[in-house]
């Protein structure tokens, strides 16, 4: 039975040209994480693998940095970065847990972070 929950940074906003940290945390399970994938819609951004460490997709290498922790830092944001981002935790023995973050990139300087929420 999958007992874990993923806590994410939730709905967040950031300024164009700035940077943002996408963060997910898996808790309430003793399943061991073997890999974390970060995806934007259907595009793979990055993988953190237990054996191989971090791999950033070549098309995002200039704007994506690994960390902090298992999170992902997006840099030089554009309005095209607005959308859904997913952290996918591959675990043993539970299986896969997925968290969702919605990022809105704003032209103005009034961007504020949204509240945290949990996805069971």
């Amino acid at each position: 039975m999958m007992t874990g929950t993923i806590e994410t940074t939730g709905n967040i906003s950031a300024e164009k040209g700035g940077s943002i940290i996408l963060q997910c945390h898996l808790s309430s399970t003793t399943a061991q994480v073997t890999q974390v994938n970060w995806e934007q819609q259907d595009q793979l951004l990055a993988i953190c693998n237990a054996d191989l460490g971090w791999h950033i997709s070549p098309s995002f290498k200039d704007r994506v940095a690994p960390g902090p922790g298992l999170g992902l830092t997006l840099q030089s944001l554009t309005v095209n970065d607005t959308g859904e981002y997913f952290c996918i935790y591959h675990t043993y023995p539970d299986g896969t847990y997925t968290g969702r973050i919605f990022l809105e990139v704003l032209e103005s300087s009034v961007a504020e972070h949204g509240a945290r929420f949990q996805i069971p």
């Epitope: 061991q32 073997t34 890999q35 974390v36 237990a50 902090p68 922790g69 298992l70 043993y92």
Partner: antibody, heavy 119, light 113 residues
Framework: EVQLVESGGGLVKPGGSLKLSCAAS????????MSWVRQTPEKRLEWVAY????????YYPDTVKGRFTISRDNAKNTLYLQMSSLKSEDTAIYYC????????????WGQGTTLTVSS | DIVMSQSPSSLAVSVGEKVTMTCKSS????????????LAWYQQKPGQSPKLLIY???TRESGVPDRFTGSGSGTDFTLTISSVKAEDLAVYYC?????????FGGGTKLEIK
Amino acid sequence: EVQLVESGGGLVKPGGSLKLSCAASGFAFSDYDMSWVRQTPEKRLEWVAYISDGGYNTYYPDTVKGRFTISRDNAKNTLYLQMSSLKSEDTAIYYCARQILLRYYFDYWGQGTTLTVSS
Amino acid sequence: DIVMSQSPSSLAVSVGEKVTMTCKSSQSLLYSSNQKNYLAWYQQKPGQSPKLLIYWASTRESGVPDRFTGSGSGTDFTLTISSVKAEDLAVYYCQQYHSYPWTFGGGTKLEIK
């Protein structure tokens, strides 16, 4: 150079409490998971507590669950182990140990601090 | 809990000899999705704290001499020292990090004749 320095050990009566500390230096402390591992007088190694890099996950074996609490202060680069309801079988050398994210082996160990539980 | 059993509990060899020690787990440490064995070996010299030698059952930690070799898969693992040196006097422990609680073997004490 990675350094982990434990402190806080001593002699405690059964039922008593004690808090151990581990000062980390030479690496980005907040990027690593951490654990406490103890070595009994018979030289057996036992893992006793784990905390994730940001402190949001903690795990314990059944032998110490409910009695031990692991915590960390990433701003101070320090790991803690609060121990209560201590028993004679908790007598051991306590090591703090570093773990790389997603890798659950212990790549660096401190020199240890000794806890003796005796009346 | 996964029980880790090491043998022999102690052995004495001469400098230059080859040494093999074994570690058996009560269940498989192989994770099928990444084909990795979640097993590590540590060396503890007298008066010192343990030091990581091998992880993923066969990957040598940086700085560890190549005379140390880890092998095996599933439930049966081996640590081999190809040509023992006097400085290898130590207790060697295996550890599974496949599932909670993480557990260690009882150790193999290597003595030099």
